[in-house]
């Protein structure tokens, strides 16, 4: 199709070489083509900014994305050629940064429903640059945490070194929906609930004498509980003795619950005590068996190929530890009678 009629938007992605970050493009279709198939997110026409990200409607929830090769070759279907770019409805997600993402991206509705739609397309010229060392050293992260139940804020990484007084108008999106336009480099969450987690995008306009660009950054926000104040507790084994059959294989499981910690370094290991000797046993890797917002249950097993008389004189000790402290639970094996 002819892309000369597409509206054009220029975007700039300045990525940090120190961190993993993502990027998104919205199929930002212009008026009036958008109006007959995009729902308006409860805004009256007077209140709607000139461009909203395409949000899809019941009859058209999808668009087609292409990349325009720089050598003038025909348009390439994104889905076929670029595994690190994922299309989710009307949004294009770039999973890895890099200057090789620079280029022209075109989106248009999959289904052409009216003569209007023939020219209903957007060409986005994306320029991708690594952040220079001269840039702000302490820019906000592309992964930010909000503490549940408290007041929090989300900072725009590309603007976090500027004061609010210097900040341009910033357009914020959450999960592809227009959130607000603020003359501030951050948005404040009054009281954090779990629904505040998601993908936030901040846009602002940067102009030079020649043209203007939309500078965009993406922030992955997760909601978290406060760091635990408790050491881990051992859920299993509960008893300190275990009846066993001599000569038979045996697996003893140690399950421990660790409270949430932002920097999470759980330790769970088995060691054996035999009179005055004590040694750590190499056992299968620990595995997480349940993970929630507040805590994680981790299990590690000790496996005896067959229980010997010597094992009855030993103590098998499960040791668990987090940054607060440690807990142990020992098990003495006892021969089953009868």
């Amino acid at each position: 199709f002819n892309i000369s009629g597409c509206s054009t938007k220029k975007l700039l992605w300045t990525y940090s070489t120190r961190s993993e970050e993502e990027f998104v493009l919205f199929c930002d279709l212009p008026e009036p083509q958008k109006s007959h198939f995009c729902h308006r997110n409860r805004l009256s026409p007077k209140q709607v900014p000139e461009h909203l990200p395409f949000m899809g409607s019941n009859d058209l929830s999808d668009v087609q994305w292409y990349q325009q090769p720089s050598n003038g070759d025909p348009l390439e279907d994104i889905r076929k050629s670029y595994p690190h770019i994922i299309q989710d409805k009307c949004t294009l997600h770039f999973l890895t940064p890099g200057v090789n993402n620079s280029g022209s991206y075109i989106c248009r509705p999959k289904m052409i429903k009216s003569p209007y739609d023939v020219a209903c397309c957007v060409k986005m010229i994306l320029e991708v640059k690594p952040q220079t060392n001269a840039s702000c050293e302490y820019s906000a992260s592309h992964k930010q945490d909000l503490l549940l139940g408290s007041t929090g804020s989300i900072s725009c990484p590309s603007l976090s070194c500027q004061s609010d007084a210097q900040s341009p108008a910033v357009t914020w999106y959450k999960n592809g929906k227009l959130l607000s336009v603020e003359r501030s480099n951050r948005i404040v969450v009054d009281e954090v609930y779990d629904y505040h987690q998601g993908t936030y995008v901040c846009d602002y306009t940067q102009s030079d004498t020649v043209s203007s660009w939309t500078v965009r950054a993406v922030v992955q926000v997760r909601t978290i509980v406060g760091d635990t104040k408790l050491k881990p507790d051992i859920l299993d084994p509960v008893e300190d003795t275990l009846e066993v059959e001599l000569g038979k294989p045996l697996t003893i499981s140690c399950k421990a619950r660790f409270g949430f910690e932002r920097v999470f370094n759980p330790v769970i290991k088995w060691y054996i005590k035999d009179s005055d000797l004590e040694w750590e046993v190499s056992v299968p890797e620990a595995k997480s068996i349940k993970s929630t917002l507040k805590d994680e249950i981790i299990e590690r097993n000790i496996i005896l190929e067959k229980v010997t008389q010597r094992d009855l004189r030993r103590k098998f000790v499960c040791f668990v530890q987090n940054s607060i402290g440690n807990t142990t639970q020992s098990v003495q094996l006892k021969e089953k009678r009868g």
């Epitope: 007041t151 959130l179 607000s180 948005i187 969450v189 009054d190 009281e191 629904y195």
Partner: nanobody, 124 residues
Framework: DVPLQESGGGLVQAGGSLRLSCAAS????????MGWFRQAPGKEREFVAT????????YYADSVKGRFTISRDNAKNTWYLQMNSLRPEDTAVYYC?????????????????WGQGTQVTVSS
């Protein structure tokens, strides 16, 4: 049934004061940010001030900073706008609004619930 109800508007001389109140009939209406906006004849609705229900964090438009104070009484589910040193250019219909998103926003279209407005007229 209007979920928000303003009161306290009226006619005042330049330099005078007024206190506007906004009562929310439903607690869920005022879960997040609570704001005041105004609309003068022939002009667009503009942001005046907003306050976070839990945090008490406030934002003001530059034109009212130092003159207007927004406050809230969570127990009464009511918030206020104390307007001092009023000027003729403050003449407008004042609307209270609530935003249940939990994010403190200054963008008028982001607010879910609106009152019917109260007229404030400042004469010179």
């Amino acid at each position: 049934d209007v979920p928000l109800q303003e009161s306290g508007g009226g006619l005042v001389q330049a330099g005078g004061s007024l206190r506007l109140s906004c009562a929310a009939s439903d607690r869920t209406v005022s879960k997040g940010a609570m704001g005041w906006f105004r609309q003068a004849p022939g002009k667009e609705r503009e942001f005046v001030a907003t306050i976070g229900r839990s945090s008490g964090i406030t934002y003001y438009a530059d034109s009212v900073k130092g003159r207007f104070t927004i406050s809230r009484d969570n127990a009464k589910n009511t918030w206020y706008l104390q307007m001092n040193s009023l000027r003729p250019e403050d003449t407008a219909v004042y609307y209270c609004a609530a935003d249940s998103s939990g994010i403190i926003r200054t963008t008028s279209w982001a607010y879910d619930y609106w009152g019917q407005g109260t007229q404030v007229t400042v004469s010179s």
